[in-house]
């Protein structure tokens, strides 16, 4: 689940079994010149950044929930 910082794909691997309880925010990065794939980077309650699998149904659910809560705030 390491997150790199250079101008390339930031997610070297993704975490399995992520739970929404400790996710403070989610950043969805669309494919671009720096990286050919969609990347989902979550910031956890303790400040740690973790890469999530954008194809995972639970991750899709988490992103949807986060976007909906952003809209209602």
């Amino acid at each position: 689940a390491s997150v790199a910082t250079e101008l390339r794909c930031q997610c070297l691997q993704t975490l399995q079994g992520i739970h929404p309880k400790n996710i403070q925010s989610v950043n969805v990065k669309s494919p671009g010149p720096h990286c050919a794939q969609t990347e989902v980077i979550a910031t956890l309650k303790n400040g740690r950044k973790a890469c999530l699998n954008p194809a995972s149904p639970i991750v899709k659910k988490i992103i949807e929930k986060m976007l909906n809560s952003d809209k209602s705030n």
């Epitope: 689940a1 975490l15 399995q16 079994g17 992520i18 739970h19 309880k21 400790n22 979550a42 956890l44 309650k45 303790n46 400040g47 740690r48 973790a50 639970i58 659910k61």
Partner: antibody
């Protein structure tokens, strides 16, 4: 390596209070939720509640609200649970357990503290 | 609160054999189930989380499957050190709730 060291066994009187401790080492104590779990003799496990030492945030099982109070001391990396107005129903082994940050699985547990309520 | 119904409450099996324990949740728990091994005088040990992910250091003889409300946990090639009580735990919704436990004995 991660370790959770709990305080020793307690023999207490009905109606009194007890405070048990769980000293954490081997990780950033402030950054992980600490859970507390009860096991009565010959019975299963019951989740009491949890505390996030970083900001003092707590979640309680409604069944234990008012019975147990969770606190944490960041300077000593120690979590505490105070049990009030003790009755024989509170005689049990109490465990602390760290909750992993990303998937909330309880991955490390203390050895348990036995509390016996008896007159 | 979500209820977790675990069965059987006890079982006896032969060394080298296979056992399966089931847990049924009172509602969909989105695969957020963990399985613990508990031996007397010790703290419980996390074996599997998120339905099927094995904890580091746990032998591949242990496995878990399930979705929705129905989940199961299996141990194959039973060894003497597997004697323990096993619990499921749902952590989809607070309060976290455990199943009643399954005491495993060797014949």
């Amino acid at each position: 390596q991660v370790q959770l060291q709990q305080s020793g066994a307690e023999l207490v009187r009905p109606g009194s209070s007890v405070k048990i401790s769980c000293k954490a080492s081997g990780y950033a104590f402030s950054d992980y939720w600490m859970n507390w779990v009860k096991q009565r003799p010959g019975q299963g496990l019951e989740w009491i509640g949890q505390i996030y030492p970083g900001d003092g945030d707590t979640n309680y099982n409604a069944k234990f609200k008012g019975k147990g109070t969770l606190t944490a001391d960041k300077s000593s990396s120690t979590a505490y649970m105070q049990l009030n107005s003790l009755t024989s129903e509170d005689s049990a082994v109490y465990f602390c357990a760290r909750e992993r940050d990303y998937d909330v699985a309880m991955d490390y547990w203390g050895q348990g503290t036995s509390v016996t309520v008896s007159s | 609160d979500i209820q977790m119904t675990q069965s059987p409450s006890s079982l006896s099996a032969s060394l080298g054999g296979k056992v399966t324990i089931t847990c049924k949740a009172s509602q969909d728990i989105n695969k957020y189930i963990a399985w613990f091994q508990h031996k007397p005088g010790k703290g419980p040990r996390l074996v599997i989380h998120y339905t099927s992910i094995l904890q580091p250091g746990i032998p591949s003889r242990f496995s878990g499957v399930g979705s929705g409300r129905d989940y199961s946990f299996s141990i194959r090639n039973l060894e003497p050190e597997d004697i323990a009580t096993y619990y499921c735990l749902q952590y989809d919704n607070l309060p976290w709730t455990f199943g009643g436990g399954t005491k495993l004995e060797i014949k």
